[in-house]
C-alpha cells in the first residue's frame, strides 16, 4: 500500500513591523506540536509594503487601508484558508511613531485606530497594533537572534548548524539600526547594570539572563542625518551647505520646514534667513566622521562609563549580531565579510565617499537616487556609532557579525515579539518527549 502523507499540523503568525521609513509584514510558521521547542519557528515570507512608514500618513489616514492591502492579500495567499481565522496578527510600531506621539498623542492614536480598523477587516485573528518601547525593540531583537542561533537550547551539539555559531551557550549581543532609532542589547560580563532603565531580567528555557539594553531615539540613520544637517546649517554662511557626507558633485535642495519637522532637530532649531538651502556634496570621509561625532555628547557621564549623551553602557562583551540597517548599508557597501578589518572598512569608506556623484550613479544605475546618495553618510555614521558611540575598537570589530538572515529568518525584533506574545518561549526548559524529532507512522 502507498504511504499517505499526513496533513501537516502547523501554525502561522503574522507580525507587521511599522518602522519609520517603511512597513514590512513577516509570516512565521511552526509545527503545532513543538511550540515550546527552541528554534522551530521560521519565517516563510516577508512582504515589504510599498510606501513610507505609517507615521507619514498622519494627514492622509484614509489611504492606510489601501497601503496595507497588497501585503495582507499576500498573507491570505501564503497561509492556507483553513488557518486564517486562527492566525494571530500583531503590528508593532517603532521610533517613527514614538516621534509622532511626542508631537501629538491624538494624531498618533488616529493613525493607530485606522491601522487597527484596516487590519481587523481581514479574516485573521488580529491582536492589536501598538507602539512598542525602545526597550522592547532591543529586547525582542536580542531574543530573535539568540533563538535563531540556537543559544537557548540546552543540548550541546558537536556540529554547527548555523553560521556564527561558536558552539557555546554564550548569547550574542544585538545591534539594531533603524531609520529613527538604534538599539544596543547584550549580556554584560559580571557587571552591575548601573541604571535600572537599562536592565532587563529574563528567565528563558530554565536559565536566567541579566540583559543590558538601550534605544537611542533620534539616532537611527535617517534622523541622525536630519540632526547633522540641522546642526551644520546653523553655521552655514548662506543657503549653500557644503557637506562632506555626500559625494562630490551631488546637489539637493532641502526645505527648512522639512528639516525642523521632526522633534529630533529641535535642539538645533534657529530662525534662518532662507526657506530652502542646497546641499553640495564634497565627499570627504574624515570631515563627515568629525561632523557626525558632534552629535554624540561624550562630555558628560554620571556612571562608570557611558555610550554618549550620558547613557550608561557596560563594557562590551562577546559577539554581536548587527542587523537591519547595519546590515543593509554594509551589504550595499560590500563590507559584511568577517574578514574585513575595521581599518579596511574605514579605507573603503574613504574611497567610496570621494567618488564623484556622476560616477556613483553610473556604477549603481539600478538603485534609487534617494537611497544611493545617502550610503556615504550611512556607512560613515555606522562606523562613528560603533566606534565612538559604543566603543568598539579595531580589535573588537571582529566580534561584530553583520547579519541579514539566520536560517532564512530575518534578524530583527518581530520574531521575538511574536514568540513572546504567543507564549512560545517558556521560562522553564520543556521536558523532552520521546519521538520529538521523528515520528514514524
Amino acid at each position: 500500500t502507498q504511504n499517505k502523507a499526513l496533513p501537516e499540523n502547523v501554525k502561522y503568525g503574522i507580525v507587521l513591523d511599522a518602522g519609520s521609513s517603511h512597513t514590512s509584514l513577516y509570516i512565521y510558521k511552526w509545527p503545532a506540536e513543538k511550540e515550546n521547542d527552541t528554534g522551530v519557528v521560521h519565517q516563510v515570507e516577508e512582504c515589504r509594503v510599498k510606501g513610507p512608514g505609517i507615521s507619514k500618513f498622519v494627514q492622509k489616514v484614509n489611504e492606510i487601508g489601501i497601503y496595507l492591502t497588497d501585503c495582507m492579500e499576500r498573507a491570505r495567499e501564503v497561509i492556507p484558508r483553513s488557518q486564517h481565522q486562527e492566525t494571530p496578527v500583531y503590528l508593532g510600531a517603532t521610533a517613527g511613531m514614538r516621534l509622532l506621539r511626542m508631537e501629538s498623542e491624538e494624531l498618533a492614536d488616529r493613525v493607530l485606530d485606522v491601522v487597527e480598523r484596516s487590519l481587523s477587516n481581514y479574516p485573521f485573528d488580529f491582536q492589536g497594533a501598538r507602539i512598542i518601547t525602545g526597550q522592547e525593540e532591543g529586547a525582542y531583537g536580542w531574543i530573535t537572534i539568540n533563538y535563531l542561533l540556537g543559544k537557548f537550547s540546552q543540548k550541546t551539539r558537536w556540529f554547527s548548524i548555523v553560521p556564527y555559531e561558536t558552539n557555546n551557550q554564550e548569547t550574542f549581543g544585538a545591534l539594531d539600526l533603524g531609520g529613527a532609532s538604534t538599539q544596543v542589547t547584550f549580556v554584560p560580563q559580571n557587571q552591575t547594570i548601573e541604571s535600572p532603565d537599562n536592565a532587563l531580567q529574563f528567565r528563558l528555557y530554565g536559565k536566567d539572563y541579566n540583559v543590558y539594553t538601550h534605544s537611542f531615539l533620534c539616532y537611527g540613520k535617517d534622523q541622525a542625518l536630519w540632526q547633522k544637517l540641522a546642526k551644520d546649517i546653523q553655521v552655514a554662511s548662506n543657503e549653500i551647505l557644503r557637506d562632506p557626507c555626500f559625494h562630490p558633485g551631488y546637489k539637493k535642495v532641502v526645505n527648512v520646514s522639512d528639516l525642523y519637522k521632526t522633534p529630533c532637530t529641535k535642539r538645533f532649531e534657529m530662525t534662518l534667513p532662507f526657506q530652502q538651502f542646497e546641499i553640495q556634496g564634497i565627499g570627504n570621509y574624515q570631515q563627515c566622521h568629525q561632523s557626525i561625532l558632534e552629535l554624540f555628547n561624550t562630555s558628560y557621564c554620571p556612571y562608570s562609563q557611558c555610550a554618549f549623551n550620558g547613557i550608561f553602557l557596560p563594557p562590551l562583551q562577546g559577539d554581536f549580531g548587527a542587523f537591519s540597517a547595519f546590515y543593509f548599508v554594509m551589504k550595499f557597501l560590500n563590507l559584511t565579510s568577517e574578514k574585513v578589518s575595521q581599518e579596511k572598512v574605514t579605507e573603503m569608506m574613504k574611497k567610496f565617499c570621494a567618488q564623484p556623484w556622476e560616477e556613483i550613479k553610473t556604477s549603481y544605475a539600478g538603485v534609487k537616487e534617494k537611497y544611493l546618495s545617502e550610503y556615504c553618510f550611512s556607512g560613515t555614521y555606522i562606523l562613528s556609532l560603533l566606534l565612538q558611540g559604543y566603543h568598539f575598537t579595531a580589535d573588537s570589530w571582529e566580534h561584530i557579525h553583520f547579519i541579514g538572515k539566520i536560517q532564512g529568518s530575518d534578524a530583527g525584533w518581530t520574531l521575538g515579539y511574536m514568540l513572546n506574545l504567543t507564549n512560545m518561549i517558556p521560562a522553564e526548559q520543556p521536558l523532552s518527549t520521546p519521538l520529538s524529532h521523528s515520528t514514524y507512522v
Epitope: N62, D109, L112, D113, V114, S120, N121, G128
Partner: antibody
Amino acid sequence: QVQLKQSGPGLVQPSQSLSITCTVSGFSLTSYGVHWVRQSPGKGLEWLGVIWRRGSTDYNAAFMSRLSITKDTSKSQVFFKMNSLQTDDTAIYYCAGVRGDAMDYWGQGTSVTVSS
Amino acid sequence: DIVMTQSHKSMSTSVGDRVSVTCKASQNVGTNVAWYQQKPGQSPKALIYSASYRYSGVPDRFTGSGSGTDFTLTISNVQSEDLAEYFCQQYNSYPLTFGGGTKLEIK
C-alpha cells in the same frame, strides 16, 4: 457574553437633538470600536458613524455636520448625539460592536419617532 | 458612494432546499463584504465577513462567496428558523453601505 444595551428616548420633537447611550458588556471599548447604523422602511440600513478604540471617529459625510459620537471607556459607554432631527430621521437606531467594519455584535435598537 | 444592489426583494423556498441570495456592488470592493440576518422584530445578526468567512456559531449551511462586484450568500438545507431578511454590506470604502435586503419566505 457580549451585549450592547441601548437607552434613549422614543419620541423627539422636530429640530431637537437625539441622544442615545450604548452600554457594552462582555468586551472592552479599548479593544472594540462601535458603529452606529439606522434602519427605516424608506431608506433601509444607513451607516452613520463609528468611534474607534483610541477614541478617533469617522462619520458618514451626509450626517457629519450634525453628528457626534463620544465614549467613556471606564464606564463601557458610547454616546451618540444627532442634532436638528427632522421627520425623515424617524428610524430604529442601532449601535454595533466591531473589530473592523463588519458589524460583529448589534444592540437591541432604539426606535425613534420624530414628530411634534 | 458604493451602491449595493440586492435584486430580489424576496425569495420563496422550502425547508431542505438550497437558496442563493445575491448582491452586486457598483464598483470593485474586493472581498470586503459582510452578510447579516435579521429576523422579524429583531436586530441584525452577523453571519459572514470578508465575503466568505463564517462568524463562530453560525451554522455551516450558510456559505458566502464572491469577490470584486458579485457576491452570494448560499443557504443549503434551509430550515424554518432561516425565515428572515438578509442584507449585504460593503466595507471597502467609506461611507459603509448596505444592500436593500432580501426577504426569505418559507413555503
